[in-house]
């Protein structure tokens, strides 16, 4: 249950719960929108985004989008509601504490996207193959 003090302090429409009834709190995410990036051929990269923003809604998670085409590389960092698609893709890894990049099919470019639900988790984006695995034992190690 929500402590009475909190109920008195805030409006009820600010209280959002997950499927288990636990209260969800607004998250802090890196939020630089689209910026040029030097992140290429690395196992992981830092976002180099100096803006940490509080997400508008408690259900929003952190998202990072890495794109490479013939001209440049960009990294996008935002908050986004996982119930809604982003760049036409579902945020299937939104509950992950780490931002583990998954490649998506986009014509004319290389496109990776990740989402995660811990503070500033989109500051460190992970491309390493060891994370992109279907091995359940390894996933246990990663998410412990």
């Amino acid at each position: 249950t929500i402590p009475p003090h909190v109920q008195k302090s805030v409006n009820n429409d600010m209280i959002v719960t997950d499927n288990n009834g636990a209260v969800k709190f607004p998250q802090l995410c890196k939020f630089c929108d689209v910026r040029f990036s030097t992140c290429d051929n690395q196992k992981s990269c830092m976002s180099n985004c100096s803006i940490t923003s509080i997400c508008e809604k408690p259900q929003e998670v952190c998202v990072a989008v890495w794109r490479k085409n013939d001209e440049n590389i960009t990294l996008e960092t935002v908050c986004h509601d996982p119930k809604l698609p982003y760049h036409d893709f579902i945020l299937e890894d939104a509950a992950s504490p780490k931002c583990i990049m998954k490649e998506k099919k986009k014509p004319g470019e290389t496109f990776f996207m990740c989402s995660c639900s811990s503070d500033e988790c989109n500051d460190n984006i992970i491309f390493s193959e060891e994370y992109n695995t279907s091995n359940p034992d390894l996933l246990l190690v990663i998410f412990q």
Partner: antibody
């Protein structure tokens, strides 16, 4: 009624480490409904956010102090502490350990009385 | 980090008068702005959060308005206990930052 009380030495020498403790009574810091942290106020000046956390999530530090500030939590004693290394006269301030509802994190609805720390040789 | 500029630095008014305090942000803070009152030798006290929501136990004479970069705290009729320093604070981008304060003094 949740209350906070700051404690620590009132005088610290330059280049040393400032250590303060905040004791929470009437509740638990492992209650994630509340955010906790440290804010300071130099004499006659404005307020500066040092860092904050809520239970189960990582501690957020002000980048301007990040390399020097460490907040640690002892849930068994219902305490959390601040260590600020390599202090100078500019770190002289009243230090508060405020609390706020996590649903509106960043808003402070309860403050301790604060403790004055003077950095001087 | 976001810089909050409060004006005026000092406001000299008499009890019963209306006080209007301004806070301007260096970039948009959406509606994530709070106001605090601080009296000498005391810790600050939360008055308003998220631009216009009064905190628990705060009298109706205190009201907040604004969004984006421009915010106002209004005290409709000053009581003797309202003479203090008032700080605005944003929580849109972290670290949260405070304005330099407006002192409301007795004229």
């Amino acid at each position: 009624q949740l209350q906070v009380q700051e404690s620590g030495p009132g005088l610290v020498k330059p280049s040393e480490t400032l250590s303060l403790t905040c004791t929470v009574s009437g509740g638990s810091i492992s209650n994630s409904y509340f955010s906790w942290g440290w804010i300071r106020q130099p004499p006659g000046k404005g307020l500066e956010w040092i860092g904050s956390f809520y239970y189960g999530e990582k501690t957020y530090y002000n980048p301007s102090l990040k390399s020097r500030a460490t907040i640690s939590i002892d849930t068994s004693k219902s305490q959390f502490s601040l260590k600020l290394s390599s202090v100078t006269a500019a770190d002289t301030a009243v230090y508060y350990c405020p609390r706020g509802p996590t649903v509106i994190r960043g808003v402070i609805d309860s403050w301790g009385q604060g403790t004055l720390v003077t950095v001087s040789s | 980090e976001i810089v909050l500029t409060q004006s005026p630095a000092t406001l000299s008014l008499s009890p019963g008068e209306r006080a209007t305090l301004s806070c301007r942000a260096s970039q948009s803070v959406r509606s994530y702005l709070a106001w605090y009152q601080q009296k000498p030798g005391q810790a600050p006290r939360l008055l308003i959060y998220d631009a216009s929501n009064r905190a628990t136990g705060i009298p109706a004479r205190f009201s907040g308005s604004g969004s984006g970069t421009d915010f106002t705290l209004t005290i409709s009729s000053l009581e003797p206990e309202d003479f203090a320093v008032y700080y605005c604070q944003q929580r849109s981008n972290w670290p949260p930052t405070f304005g330099q304060g407006t002192k409301v003094e007795i004229k």
